[in-house]
Each structure stands twice: as structure tokens, then as C-alpha cells.
Interface confidence: medium
């Protein structure tokens, strides 16, 4: 349990301490106060090291101290002989004594006081980001006009979220442009237009100074564009480092702007635009486009149709052509809908014959139809090869669409016959 | 057959098996079976196997029975009331249209039919083979298949054979030119129960092949001269007969 | 006049394995079927296998099946069984014999004993 | 398989009987059958094949007669020469089988 003071004697006193003694003693005073630690009295047997017998002061895994002979005070006016001061609310006092003594020593006597600590200046690390405040057993922070203290009661930043951009065209700033931005916040904007328009960013690189990176390469204060799961940046430093016209593919853009304690720059101002969704020219394979154009944007509309020896199967039903919407989601609509080969199926088996597993039933696929040799053989000819045509069937350069005949090889025994010798 | 060889169904796979009457066939394509007509003109719905070198019941089970649609003999061929007192056998041929189409392979592959050009006209000398399970020196009927080569020979040859078992005057059994006479060499003959077996001539035109240039029809005495059915002599009533009578998918 | 002679018998470990030869003569040997055939001591006969002419058709017992093998070499008139994994049980005289007439087995040879013992 | 049934599986007759071994077929084996002779210390030896049909050399004292599941093989007239192990043996499905064999003595 903490308590507010102590006293500390070695074993006996003030009679002579006993051979082969090893004590310990552990302090603790409330949190938020230091301990203030000192000797009255102190008659240890003396030795190099202090290693015969010796008391040693530890706080955490640092030895403070530790001692051994007789000590007396510098200053008539106080008794204390040695004393320390932590500014931890724990401490570790061990008394050894080892096997023989040549005099008789009377050991040691010590007392504890709780001590107020300054969190705002005793440390190396500040505590507060802006002001810090202290009071017997802590401190709190505080934060100056326009700023709020974050949820870990250390940071104070500026409240600067929440705005929505919906309008077609604008502007956006971090917080006191051109003056430098807040220190320690995070400010995150929304731009939210009509579906079917993609936000398109447009900078100046000369609208940009934000704190640069690290050694490391990692931004300290930095600019982010998020637009579903695509991410542009972070950025930062002097002068904008990405493109200058960043096209989000989408109607909703998140803007972070994240800075740390340090380093305030004049931040940042950029434009926005919503722009017709543009869906890709693609490169759809074995069709033609109608109208051909150099660029498609929301709402247009286009007709596939197939090149020779290809079909769109949509369901079960083979067509030609199909049409396709430019959506506002920057997709083509019917894009599942491909020019695919035509697809002959499976060839139809025969009698007495097989037909290898085609590696591929499309158009322009070749496969080969085999008798069951040695006992059947191809009677119609054509030598079996057939072709995928454009009409899904399967063709053969003599017989067309009609399938090889495996008829019987005749009066050939498998085995010639040896007849009896006489 | 007599004065023959063991032999196995791979050195045959054309031969069929009737078991009644105990008799030969010939295999000449997947709905077909060729035969001599007086095989079948006594039961026209006869049981057929291929496939097997051995006719035991066991070994039988185990292979390929083959069932027929129709039996088509010969016009020519003329019915008696009395066949055992038979003396002409001209005309000695029929076709078995079967059922279902057979499935080829090592034991089971038809024979050809002969070429209509001369090439297909035989020479005394020439050698054929012939097979089955009929009498053999030993026994009424062989148990395993067995066969033996023997020369074409001239006509007269069988007629000068005296007939064992007579069943009407010498002079009163036919010779034509529809019937080839072979054997007379080391006691080599076809038997009863070999009728209907193919006499199998290596194709001049092809001799990795053989074709069926007779059928074992009748003999005045076993061991001596036999006479084959001369298939080439019927070749044009086989196709019609064929063709008449086949599926569209045959066709 | 036809002899089978048999050889390649003797005292084997179990597990282990023997071949052994048929020396055929006094007939073309091409043109028959051959059998094996054994004997245990003091039992009666027991066909353990059948080889074709050409040597395209065996059939084996069930209780050697898998472990022996039938073989022919008609250039050299002989006939060979192979035994492999042997066991106590396979202990007989074995005896190779012609296959004549549909299956009866016309001539026999002396007969050659194996032992299977550890 | 086909199971062959011989009996008695030993007899003892005096010279010039009439000697009766009977073998029965677990199955119709038609007369896919075969009766063999072994003397002591030697190799069997083919005596009549097909139930009933005599091999060539062999003395007509030895008959045999029988079909379907049933066969008897018959010596008409008991010689001392004849003292051996008789056994049938089927030949209508692989695997050949054996009868167990009849010992016939002389008293």
C-alpha cells in the first residue's frame, strides 16, 4: 500500500547488525510524487566496492547508490549523512551483510518523504503538445484559442472535418492558407457529386508547401486522396510532387490532410471538377464498334458486332451483335457480353472410332478422328481431320459437315496361323 | 477337320460357331455372317458365337453369342423334304443378318469377299485354309478350333472319290462350277461340322489379307477331296442381298 | 519319340524364387498347348498353369496367380514357369506336360521337386 | 471352380475283378472329362479322354462312360500291372481340376 513516508533500519539497530544477513525493502508512494530518500545514521563495514557488506538503492533497473563505512553530516544543522531523490513512486532498498565482521558496526538508519514532481519540466519528453500545468501528485494539459485537447488529453489540435463539397466545381484549402497550417490535426473534406461524373483534382505545384519527408522517406505532415479503393499520395514537401490532374474514376473523393507537432508550412489550395464519367476504349477482341469515337463519356452508347466465326452467347442464344451504355460508374453496361469464338461443342462421337478430347471446341479448332486400328479403318475418307467453321459446326475439307465411317478391316488375323508339322 | 493343327481364334477371327446344327460360319462384316445354306435351312434362327477358340458350354459363356434378324438362303438353293438324301448342293450359300453389330477386335474381324476381276479366279494348287470344330481323327467334334491348309484341286478329282456313306447312286450327285474342289495332300479335309467355314485364299492384290474364296459345303468322304461353295460365283447376290437389308446408319 | 524333361527344382527359403525349364522333344513343339502340373507329397494332382502355341493365351491357378509366370520359347523347345514369392504350400513335384486333343494331357515329363522350406 | 468328387479314394481287389471308381462333377461338364493313371514314383499317364474314348495304346481292359455330372471308370479284368493311383480330371473350365485320387491295391 503507498504511503506518504517511512522508515528504513537495518536489522538490530541500533545494536550491531548479524553476520549473513541479505533485506530488502520496497517503497512506494502514491503516483504523481517522487521519493525523497535519505541516511541519519550509517556504520557499515567498510570495503572496496562496498563489497563485503554494503546497502544499495535501486529505482526500476537503475542502482542509485549503494553504501558502505561511516558517514557523518557536512552540515551541523541537519543529521542527514547521504540521501536521494527519484522522481519515480518506487524504490528498492537491500541490506547484505556477508559471513564475519572485524568490529561491530551498527548499520544503517533511513527515512522517506513522499516529493511533489514537475511532469512539465522534470522530463526529458514533454507530456503536452501545448501547455502543460502542474499540481502536487500531476498535471494536466491545455491548448490555446481555436484548438480542442484530443481524446489522450495530451494533444490539442484544430477542429477542421466535416465539410461536404457536392457543388460541380470548387475550392479547397488547409486550415489559415497561406499562413501556416495547424499544428497536430487531422482534417479530412468530402467531395460528393452526382453519379456518372468522376472528381478530377487539379494543383499548381507552386499552391503547395507542407512539412517534408523523414530521412526514411515517410511524409511527416501529409496530403491524401482517397476515392473507394484507390489511394493518391501521401504527399508532401515543397512544391506538389504528383499529377497535376489527378482523375478519381469516381464520384466521391476523401481528402486527409494529417500533420504532426512540428514543422508548420504554408500547406495547401487546390481545385476541383466534376468530369462526364469516361468509360475506357476497350480493346474488345474480334468485333467492330459503332460509332467509332476517340473518347466515350457517361450516357453514350455503342454497337458491338462480331467479326466472322464469332457469336455473343448470352444465355443460349447465339447472336452477332449486342449494345453497350457507357454507365455512370465509368462501366460499360453488357461488358460481361464478349465476342467469343463459336463454340462447335464437343464433336459427336462415332461407331468403332474416337475422337481425341479437343484441346479447344472453337472456331478454327482442328480435331481428328481415329478408327480402332488394327480393325477398323475409314471408309468414307476425308483422312479424319475436321475444323471448327464459322457456323459451329464441325467440317471436313471432303466430306463437310458428315461424320467419318470406321468399318471393319477385313481377313486380317491377329495372328498368322502355323500349322502342324508331319 | 481333319489331319489339321490346334489352332486359336487370333489365327481365325472371322469364324463363327453354330451349335445346331454343329457347323461354320464366316464373319464378312459387322451385320453379316456368311454360311452354307444347308446349315441354316433346317433351323433359321441359329445361335452363333465368335470369339472363342474353345466351343466348351464354359468358354462359350464367355464369349460373343450373336443373335440373328433374318436368314436369307440362296434362291438357287433347292429345299428337300428329305435333306439328308441330299445330292445337289449347288447353290450351297446363305447370309445371316444379325441383330446388333459386332465389336472388332483381336479374336473377332470379318474376312473379305473375293474381287470380281480374274485375280480372284483360282488356280489348282492354290492354298487355302480352312477351320473349324467338326470331326477330327479322334472325335465327332473338336473341342478347340482346328485347321489346315490345303490346294485347290481340280473337279474331278472329287468326283473320282467314292461317296463312304452313299444315300442315292454315285452318278447321281452334282458337280458345278459353283463348287471348288480342294485337298486330297496328307489327309487334310474338311469333316461334318466344319460346313460353312470359310476356305480362306490370301488375297493376290494384298497378302497381309485373306478372303473367303470358299465355304465348306459338302465331300464324298473325310480325309480325301472336299468341295467348297465358290463365293466369288455369288459376290453380286451378297452385296444386293446386303444392301437391301441394311439399316439407314449402314448405308 | 516325345520327352519332357523338367529341371531348375531344389530347397528354396520361403519368399524366395525358382524357374523352372521344360526341355521338349520327339515332336514340334510350336504346335502344342503346354501345361504345368504339381504334386504335393503324398496328395493328389493340382494344375497350376496353361500356356497357348503362340504363348498369347495363359491362364494360372488362383493360388498362384501373381506370384508365378508361364512362359514359352518355341525356337528353343522349351517351357519355363518362373515362381516367385514362394511359400511352404508351393512344396510338390512339378510336372510340365503336352496339351493335345482338346485338352487331355497326352505326355507328362518325370516331374522336378521343389522344396520351400527355411 | 469345378469341384471333382472321386471315390473310394482306396480299394484293394484281387486279380481278374472288375474294378468300379466313380467321379462326380460339382457342375455339368458334358463329357469334358479325362482318366489318368500314375504308378508310384512316376508321372501320370492319359488313359481315356472325353468320358468314354480309349488313347491310342492303351489296354481295353479300361473303359470309361458317363456324362453331365456322373462318370465311371471301369477295369474289367484287375492286372497285377495295374496296381496305381487313378484320378479323373475336368477339362470344361479353367482351372483343370482333379479328382482326389483312388489307390487300388491287389489283396
Known amino acids: 500500500e503507498p504511503t506518504m513516508y517511512g522508515e528504513i533500519l537495518s536489522p538490530n539497530y541500533p545494536q550491531a547488525y548479524p553476520s549473513e544477513v541479505e533485506k530488502s525493502w520496497d517503497i512506494e508512494v502514491p503516483e504523481g510524487y517522487g521519493i525523497h530518500l535519505y541516511f541519519t545514521h550509517l556504520d557499515i563495514e567498510l570495503s572496496e566496492n562496498c563489497a563485503y557488506d554494503s546497502v544499495q538503492i535501486i529505482s526500476g533497473d537503475t542502482e542509485e547508490g549503494r553504501l558502505c563505512g561511516q558517514r557523518s553530516s557536512n552540515n551541523p544543522h541537519s543529521p542527514i549523512v547521504e540521501e536521494f531523490q527519484v522522481p519515480y513512486n518506487k524504490l528498492q532498498v537491500i541490506f547484505k551483510s556477508d559471513f564475519s565482521n572485524e568490529e561491530r558496526f551498527t548499520g544503517f538508519a533511513a527515512y522517506y518523504v513522499a516529493t511533489d514532481i514537475n511532469e512539465c519540466t522534470d522530463f526529458v519528453d514533454v507530456p503536452c503538445s501545448h501547455f502543460c500545468n502542474n499540481f502536487i501528485g500531476g498535471y494536466f494539459c491545455s491548448c490555446p484559442p481555436e484548438y480542442f485537447l484530443h481524446d489522450d488529453m495530451k494533444n490539442c489540435g484544430v477542429n477542421c472535418s466535416g465539410d461536404v463539397f457536392t457543388a460541380l466545381i470548387g475550392e479547397i484549402a488547409s486550415p489559415n492558407y497561406p499562413k501556416p497550417y495547424p499544428e497536430n490535426s487531422r482534417c479530412e473534406y468530402q467531395i460528393r457529386l452526382e453519379k456518372g461524373f468522376q472528381v478530377v483534382v487539379t494543383l499548381r505545384r507552386e499552391d503547395f508547401d507542407v512539412e517534408a519527408a523523414d530521412s526514411a522517406g515517410n511524409c511527416l505532415d501529409s496530403l491524401v486522396f482517397v476515392a473507394g479503393d484507390r489511394q493518391f499520395g501521401p504527399y508532401c514537401g515543397h512544391g506538389f510532387p504528383g499529377p497535376l490532374n489527378i482523375e478519381t474514376k469516381s464520384n466521391a473523393l476523401d481528402i486527409i490532410f494529417q500533420t504532426d507537432l512540428t514543422g508548420q508550412k504554408k500547406g495547401w489550395k487546390l481545385r476541383y471538377h466534376g468530369d462526364p464519367m469516361p468509360c475506357p476504349k476497350e480493346d474488345t477482341p474480334n468485333s467492330v464498334w459503332e460509332p467509332a469515337k476517340a473518347k466515350y463519356v457517361f450516357r453514350d452508347v455503342v454497337q458491338i458486332t462480331c467479326l466472322d466465326g464469332f457469336e455473343v452467347v448470352e444465355g443460349r442464344v447465339g447472336a452477332t451483335s449486342f449494345y453497350s451504355t457507357c454507365q455512370s460508374n465509368g462501366k460499360w453496361s453488357n461488358s460481361k457480353l464478349k465476342c467469343q469464338p463459336v463454340d462447335c461443342g464437343i464433336p459427336e462421337s462415332i461407331e468403332n472410332g474416337k475422337v481425341e478430347d479437343p484441346e479447344s471446341t472453337l472456331f478454327g479448332s482442328v480435331i481428328r478422328y481415329t478408327c480402332e486400328e488394327p480393325y477398323y479403318y475409314m471408309e468414307n475418307g476425308g483422312g479424319g481431320e475436321y475444323h471448327c467453321a464459322g457456323n459451329g459446326s464441325w467440317v471436313n475439307e471432303v466430306l463437310g459437315p458428315e461424320l467419318p465411317k470406321c468399318v471393319p478391316v477385313c481377313g486380317v488375323p491377329r495372328e498368322p496361323f502355323e500349322e502342324k508339322q508331319r | 477337320i481333319i489331319g489339321g493343327s490346334d489352332a486359336d481364334i487370333k489365327n481365325f477371327p472371322w469364324q463363327v460357331f453354330f451349335d445346331n446344327p454343329w457347323a461354320g460360319g464366316a464373319l464378312i462384316n459387322e451385320y453379316w455372317v456368311l454360311t452354307a445354306a444347308h446349315v441354316v435351312e433346317g433351323n433359321r434362327e441359329p445361335t452363333m458365337y465368335v470369339g472363342s477358340t474353345s466351343v466348351q458350354t464354359s468358354r462359350l459363356a464367355k464369349s460373343k453369342m450373336l443373335t440373328p434378324e433374318h436368314v436369307f438362303i440362296h434362291p438357287g438353293w433347292k429345299l428337300l423334304e428329305v435333306p439328308e438324301g441330299r445330292t445337289n448342293f449347288d447353290n450351297d450359300i446363305a447370309l445371316v443378318r444379325l441383330k446388333d453389330p459386332v465389336k472388332m477386335g483381336p479374336t473377332v474381324s470379318p474376312i473379305c469377299l473375293p474381287g470380281t476381276s480374274s485375280d480372284y479366279n483360282l488356280m489348282d494348287g492354290d492354298l487355302g485354309l480352312i477351320s473349324g470344330w467338326g470331326r477330327t481323327e479322334k472325335r465327332d467334334r473338336a473341342v478347340r478350333l482346328k485347321a489346315a491348309r490345303l490346294p485347290v484341286a481340280p473337279l474331278r478329282k472329287c468326283k473320282e472319290v467314292k461317296v463312304e456313306k452313299p444315300t442315292a447312286d454315285a452318278e447321281a450327285y452334282v458337280f458345278t462350277p459353283n463348287m471348288i474342289c480342294a485337298g486330297g495332300e496328307k489327309g487334310m479335309d474338311s469333316c461334318k461340322g466344319d460346313s460353312g467355314g470359310a476356305f480362306a485364299v490370301q488375297d493376290p492384290n494384298d497378302k497381309t489379307k485373306f478372303y473367303a474364296a470358299g465355304l465348306v459345303s459338302w465331300g464324298p468322304q473325310c480325309g480325301t477331296y472336299g468341295l467348297y461353295t465358290r463365293v466369288k460365283n455369288y459376290v453380286d447376290w451378297i452385296m444386293k442381298t446386303m444392301q437391301e437389308n441394311s439399316t439407314p446408319r449402314e448405308d | 519319340q516325345v520327352q519332357l524333361v523338367e529341371s531348375g527344382g531344389g530347397l528354396v527359403k520361403p519368399g524366395g524364387s525358382l524357374r523352372l525349364s521344360c526341355a521338349a522333344s520327339g515332336f514340334t513343339f510350336s504346335d502344342y498347348y503346354m501345361s504345368w502340373i504339381r504334386q504335393a507329397p503324398g496328395k493328389g494332382l493340382e494344375w497350376v498353369s496353361y500356356i497357348s502355341r503362340s504363348g498369347s493365351t495363359k491362364y494360372y491357378a488362383d493360388s498362384v496367380k501373381g506370384r508365378f509366370t508361364i512362359s514359352r520359347d518355341n525356337a528353343k523347345n522349351s517351357l519355363y514357369l518362373q515362381m516367385n514369392s514362394l511359400r511352404a504350400e508351393d512344396t510338390a513335384v512339378y510336372y510340365c506336360?503336352?496339351?493335345?486333343?482338346?485338352?487331355?494331357?497326352?505326355?507328362w515329363g518325370q516331374g522336378t521337386l521343389v522344396t520351400v522350406s527355411s | 471352380d469345378i469341384q471333382m468328387t472321386q471315390s473310394p479314394s482306396s480299394l484293394s481287389a484281387s486279380v481278374g475283378d472288375r474294378v468300379t471308381i466313380t467321379c462326380q462333377a460339382s457342375?455339368?461338364?458334358?463329357?469334358?472329362l479325362n482318366w489318368y493313371q500314375q504308378k508310384p514314383g512316376k508321372a501320370p499317364k492319359l488313359l481315356i479322354y472325353?468320358?468314354?474314348n480309349l488313347e491310342t495304346g492303351v489296354p481295353s481292359r479300361f473303359s470309361g462312360s458317363g456324362s453331365g455330372t456322373d462318370f465311371t471308370f471301369t477295369i474289367s479284368s484287375l492286372q497285377p500291372e495295374d496296381i496305381a493311383t487313378y484320378y479323373c480330371e475336368q477339362y470344361e473350365d479353367y482351372p483343370l481340376t482333379f479328382g482326389g485320387g483312388t489307390k487300388v491295391e491287389i489283396k
Open positions: 457342375q455339368d461338364i458334358s463329357n469334358y
Open positions: 506336360a503336352r496339351d493335345q486333343e482338346d485338352y487331355a494331357l497326352d505326355y
Open positions: 472325353d468320358a468314354s
